[in-house]
């Protein structure tokens, strides 16, 4: 039994690491495979994380890790049974991925525009809290070729866009995803779509 | 509100042993890390120590100045974090600070007063 | 270890004067920086963490930035309760180290 590829980890910086990687063949990964874990501290305890296939020679563990701050580094070890595979380190702060933000909703009550709002997925003692910046994904479901992508590139997580940019009388979703460029993380995945009917007011037209 | 009052320091001897308490209060004290930090007269800050939460085993980390001679240890039920100093040196002469990191957040948003240490013959 | 290197080292300046203090780290410490205000009496107050994020209750005359490994604290306008020690602080590497520290005086 051999690792074909190595592990790699991302954090979402608020209790969860995942750790993926793959075999070299058809791997049963909960009852053949052991990842250990364990911050580079004195006194420290090692946990061992039980992972899931994930497709037939993949696997994926997510790492509690409910304790983390930024300096702190954590050897990881993999084990089948009594043989060691790898062993590598992992630092969480290094290899963010952000959580997907949550509760969009397209409020479009208000006169011609479409106001798009979304919760930040972090408490405000986080360190991610005041450093995310989101895209906005809107698109038709008539027409394929009807996508946009807006950067909100502001602190607040909202958007105002005029009705008019959009068609009027069909349906359109959106959907919002998150990262930290001062922190170099990758892109959260995008949250669930919401759906709506834009619908406005064309502006008259005097001849 | 927020407080950390460090007490225990005084004037000892090289080579004797010492030991810190800082108490606080007004916040969940268990699901800090907590730290020791030190400043000799006219010098810059130092960090010396923390020691993690439970769900860490109390892990602990410790500047290279201090290893070996200096244990951080905490007391959950007494919102209440140590420092026992052992071989203490000349050099070790400081006020001596304990602060707070909260997991996935930022280090040292409150501070203690001090409270000083002098180490001479 | 990460070496943080802050200067000046001392300054002078009048009431209503902006200042600006830079702390240069020697390794990449990824925006992990706090700025720290010591009162005369000894007393610690953090201004900035995140290298630009303001401290609840810190006045909006204080700010930080970052350009590359340098960080600076900046005062707008200084105010009388402005006059103390100013430290920066690295957090994203064990051993978390200190500048050597700005002792700001009135001019």
């Known amino acids: 039994m051999k690792v074909l590829q190595e592990p790699t980890c991302v954090s979402d910086y608020m209790s969860i690491s995942t750790c993926e990687w793959k075999m070299n063949g058809p791997t049963n990964c909960s009852t053949e495979l052991r990842l250990l874990y364990q911050l580079v501290f004195l006194l420290s305890e090692a946990h061992t994380c039980i992972p899931e296939n994930n497709g037939g020679a993949g696997c994926v563990c997510h790492l509690l890790m409910d304790d983390v701050v930024s300096a702190d580094n954590y050897t990881l070890d993999l084990w089948a049974g009594q043989q060691l595979l790898w062993k590598g380190s992992f630092k969480p702060s290094e290899h963010v991925k952000p959580r997907a933000p949550g509760n969009l909703t397209v409020h479009t009550n208000v006169s011609d525009t479409l106001l798009l709002t979304w919760s930040n997925p972090y408490p405000p003692d986080n360190y991610l809290y005041n450093h995310l910046t989101y895209a906005v994904n809107i698109w038709s479901e008539n027409d394929p070729a009807d996508f946009r992508i807006y950067n909100v590139t502001y602190l607040e997580p909202s958007l105002r866009i005029a009705a008019s940019t959009l068609k009027s009388g069909i349906s359109y979703r959106a959907r919002v995803r998150a990262w930290a460029q001062c922190y170099n993380t990758t892109w959260s995945e995008w949250s669930p779509s919401t759906k709506w009917h834009n619908s406005y007011r064309e502006p008259f037209e005097q001849h | 509100q927020v407080q950390l009052v460090e007490t225990g320091g005084g004037l000892v001897r090289p080579g004797n042993s010492l030991k810190l308490s800082c108490v606080t209060s007004?916040?969940?004290?268990?699901?800090?890390?907590m730290h020791w930090l030190r400043q000799p007269p006219g010098k810059r800050l130092e960090w010396i120590a923390v020691i993690t939460v439970k769900s860490n085993n109390y892990g602990a980390n410790y500047a290279e100045s201090v290893k070996g001679r200096f244990a951080i240890s905490r007391d959950d039920s007494k919102s209440s974090v140590y420092l026992e100093m052992n071989r203490l040196r000349e050099e070790d002469t400081a006020t001596y600070f304990c602060s707070r990191e909260r997991a996935y957040g930022n280090p040292f948003d409150y501070w203690g007063q001090g409270t000083t240490l002098t180490v001479s013959s | 270890d990460i070496q943080m290197t802050q200067s000046p080292s001392s300054l002078s300046a009048s009431l209503g004067e902006r200042v600006s203090l830079t702390c240069r780290a020697s390794q990449e410490i990824s925006g992990y920086l706090s700025w720290l205000q010591q009162k005369p009496d000894g007393t610690i107050k953090r201004l900035i963490y995140a290298a630009s994020t303001l401290d609840s209750g810190v006045p909006k005359r204080f700010s930080g930035s970052r350009s590359g490994s340098d960080y600076s604290l900046t005062i707008s306008s200084l105010e009388s309760e402005d006059f103390a020690d100013y430290y920066c602080l690295q957090y994203g590497s064990y051993p978390y180290t200190f500048g050597g520290g700005t002792k700001l005086e009135i001019k």
């Open positions: 007004g916040f969940t004290f268990s699901n800090y890390r």
